[in-house]
């Protein structure tokens, strides 16, 4: 059974994941982002089901494509580069989903834009956090 300290750690990791996903989304949605139209042409795979931590496997598998789309931003000055954000997200996802069990991700038939993709995983984090608090 999960201890209160392990639950607290999981909650904190989910909160950090949520914050960085929201940061990426905010940067994309910035009305001054000239690359938004191009970014929206890229399609992402959505999970058929995302209700448990093991389903983060579906997010992990889309991190590389996410980084490639974020690289389109090509800002002359990054405080954080896309690879910094994706690297941190990857570390958190690996810790949260664990490596003990191998889970084969099932994807929905319909693909999604980067905005829809990020919103889906933001909702996932918020949902899991709400069950822990």
């Amino acid at each position: 059974a999960p201890t209160s300290s392990s639950t607290k750690k999981t909650q904190l990791q989910l909160e950090h994941l949520l914050l960085d996903l929201q940061m990426i989304l905010n940067g994309i949605n910035n009305y001054k982002n000239p690359k938004l139209t191009r970014m929206l042409t890229f399609k992402f795979y959505m999970p058929k089901k995302a209700t448990e931590l093991k389903h983060l496997q579906c997010l992990e598998e889309e991190l590389k494509p996410l980084e490639e789309v974020l690289n389109l931003a090509q800002s002359k000055n990054f405080h954080l580069r896309p690879r910094d954000l994706i690297s941190n997200i990857n570390v958190i996802v690996l810790e949260l989903k664990g490596s003990e069990t191998t889970f084969m991700c099932e994807y929905a038939d319909e693909t999604a834009t980067i905005v829809e993709f990020l919103n889906r995983w933001i909702t996932f984090c918020q949902s899991i956090i709400s069950t822990l608090t």
Partner: nanobody, 119 residues
Framework: EVQLVESGGGLVQPGGSLRLSCAAS????????MGWYRQAPGKGRELVAA???????NYADSVKGRFTISRDNAKNTVYLQMNSLKPEDTAVYYC?????????????WGQGTQVTVSS
């Protein structure tokens, strides 16, 4: 409006350590990037290190392995632990607060704190 208050600068010998702190107050959002930039005499402002509220970090190549950035989200404070300081680290260090991972005109900057590395 966001206010940034820096502290911890000073004079230190080569090989020594300093810890900079920067507290943000005002219109703070939970989703942000805080960090440190520096400007040496006669040079442009350059990134030292930055950290998101989610824990993503970016370091200048010149400080990797020597400097560590961290933050306390509850206190809206960012820290820069500087070890193995070198004379070339001498500069004015500016705290930065941003709402996005890339620089734009809505970023806020502190007044700066002087770091001098000299024997």
């Amino acid at each position: 409006e966001v206010q940034l208050v820096e502290s911890g600068g000073g004079l230190v010998q080569p090989g020594g350590s300093l810890r900079l702190s920067c507290a943000a107050s005002g219109s703070i959002f939970s989703i942000n990037v805080m960090g440190w930039y520096r400007q040496a005499p006669g040079k442009g402002r350059e990134l030292v290190a930055a950290i998101s509220s989610g824990g993503s970090t970016n370091y200048a190549d010149s400080v990797k392995g020597r400097f560590t950035i961290s933050r306390d989200n509850a206190k809206n404070t960012v820290y820069l632990q500087m070890n193995s300081l070198k004379p070339e680290d001498t500069a004015v260090y500016y705290c930065m607060y941003a709402s996005s991972w890339y620089e734009d005109e809505t970023d806020y900057w502190g007044q700066g704190t002087q770091v001098t590395v000299s024997s």
